[in-house]
């Protein structure tokens, strides 16, 4: 059997668990006595279409309720275990009163007020986090949703929606609570050099300028001590002592999948024969370690026009 719960002195409306898409009439019974539940609205507990309404609910209403869907060729019976709880005395909402947890990871996120579609409610829905009314402009109530702008871990907690159900000219309060957690999007990884390829040889023209980019990615939200740099014959460019060869400071970039990447460009103003004998290392390092791609320069072969 399925379970439903509510709070004492609040409205509770439940659906027959066997209902599916059926349009056939539904009858409700107290399963322990087999006594039929009436459809007259003057009763505190009554049936309306496929729904069983407790207006308002009381602790003694707790029990198992049976619903029977009568169709021409088959009767389907469903059972619903209804528990009505006293209101918790403190702000700590016990687990048994919690609806499913919502997980957010985007900059903007929404929380849906659980079960609200069963009720005849009117806006606005009031929202509380850990029992405090939400008044910051980042929190926006719209229809049955709470929208949170610029979500951070501090937004995690228990969110309660409170709304009014109207029936027969009487208003009843309904509250429902669910947890909201923020999933981590960031991660840090061992550096991956995306350019130049491993053991690459680059063609250059003597006397002409050349530039080589060293690019590496480190994860998402993971700049801590991440760097890319060039070494020439295992010496950092600044200490190599060749003014023609300069390194452009690593700049931040994002890859197509939002990875944190850095690029450093090695510039040679005029390539000499000597440069062809040097070893150029593109290094990427972070907290997890270091990776190196070595490249060499080769004289570009003149195009044979014969």
């Amino acid at each position: 059997s399925k379970s439903s719960w509510g709070l004492e002195n609040e409205a509770l409306i439940v659906r027959c668990p066997q209902r599916g898409r059926s349009t056939y009439p539904v009858e409700w019974y107290y399963s322990d006595t087999n006594e039929s539940i009436p459809t007259q609205k003057r009763n505190r507990i009554f049936v309306s279409r496929d729904r069983l309404k407790f207006l308002p609910a009381r602790v003694e209403d707790s029990g198992i309720y049976a619903c029977v869907i009568r169709s021409p060729n088959l009767n389907k019976t469903g059972y619903l275990n209804v528990t009505i709880h006293k209101k918790p005395p403190s702000c700590n909402i016990p687990d048994y009163l919690m609806y499913s947890t919502v997980r957010g990871s985007d900059k903007n996120f929404k929380i849906t007020c659980p079960t609200i579609d069963l009720y005849n409610w009117t806006a606005p829905v009031q929202w509380f986090k850990n029992c405090k009314a939400l008044q910051e402009p980042r929190f926006r109530a719209h229809r049955s949703y709470l929208f949170i702008d610029n979500v951070t871990h501090d937004d995690e907690g228990d969110y309660t929606c409170q709304f009014t159900h109207a029936e027969n000219g009487t208003n009843y309060i309904v509250t429902a609570t669910r947890s909201f957690t923020v999933e981590e999007k960031g991660f840090s990884m061992f550096p991956v050099i995306t350019n130049p390829p491993y053991n690459h040889t680059m063609e250059v023209e003597i006397g002409k300028p050349a530039s080589i980019a060293c690019s590496a990615c480190f994860g998402k939200g993971s700049h801590f001590l991440a760097d890319v740099l060039w070494q020439i014959n295992k010496t950092v460019v600044g200490n190599f002592g060749e003014a023609r060869i300069q390194e452009e400071e690593g700049r931040n970039e994002s890859s197509s999948n939002d990875m944190d990447c850095l690029t450093s460009v090695l510039r040679i103003t005029g390539v000499t024969e000597k440069d062809l004998s040097l070893e150029y290392d593109c290094l990427a390092l972070n907290l997890h370690g270091m990776i190196r791609h070595t490249i060499r320069l080769r004289r570009k072969q003149p195009i044979d026009h014969r």
Epitope: E184, G186, F187, S188, M189, F190, G219, G221, S222, H223, F224, L225, D227, E249, G250, N252, L287, H288, G289
Partner: antibody
Framework: QVQLVQSGAEVKKPGSSVKVSCKAS????????ISWVRQAPGQGLEWMGW????????NYAQKFQGRVTMTRDTSTSTVYMELSSLRSEDTAVYYC?????????WGQGTLVTVSS | DIQMTQSPSSLSASVGDRVTITCRAS??????LDWYQQKPGKAPKLLIS???NLGSGVPSRFSGSGSGTDFTLTISSLQPEDFATYYC?????????FGGGTKVEIK
Amino acid sequence: QVQLVQSGAEVKKPGSSVKVSCKASGGTFSNYAISWVRQAPGQGLEWMGWISAYNGNTNYAQKFQGRVTMTRDTSTSTVYMELSSLRSEDTAVYYCARSTNALDYWGQGTLVTVSS
Amino acid sequence: DIQMTQSPSSLSASVGDRVTITCRASQGIRSNLDWYQQKPGKAPKLLISIVSNLGSGVPSRFSGSGSGTDFTLTISSLQPEDFATYYCLQHNSNPPTFGGGTKVEIK
């Protein structure tokens, strides 16, 4: 919510060693590195080194080379910092902190008192 | 090692005041600078990362700026809960180094 919970306060004799633990929860342990920072009474913050939870790669500040060892236990999502040959000037609060774009989550700190 | 020089080392201010703390690096550190707030007996808390990105749950009265070697933390309107010690941290090159701290006290 990411949490780093450190072991309790320690009182140690000069020349001995101390091992402080830092248990991580609420995030993917292997996605990050854990740094260790210490603070002597009434003083500023001092970097000690880090360990990669991903592969165990370590890097120690020059000052602590040869005296500090950082290890990890992936099965319990815990990192350890052991400092040996303790002297009175090692009396400090030792913090672990998760390193991403910054030191975004910190442990509550462990007070280590070195006294004869 | 890169030296981080923080100034002033302490300052007295009143609630509502605009407060500025500066941090100077002994060499260029690109954007790899964070600011932390520490209250007595507590662990430091990340305020700002990568020069100007506000940490989780940090009020918008805190802001960061600067580049290269000179960086600034600004509190636009000091609140009672802001009385604390503030540290900058560079993590452009190893080892990362903290500034000496700025203690913000009630005038």
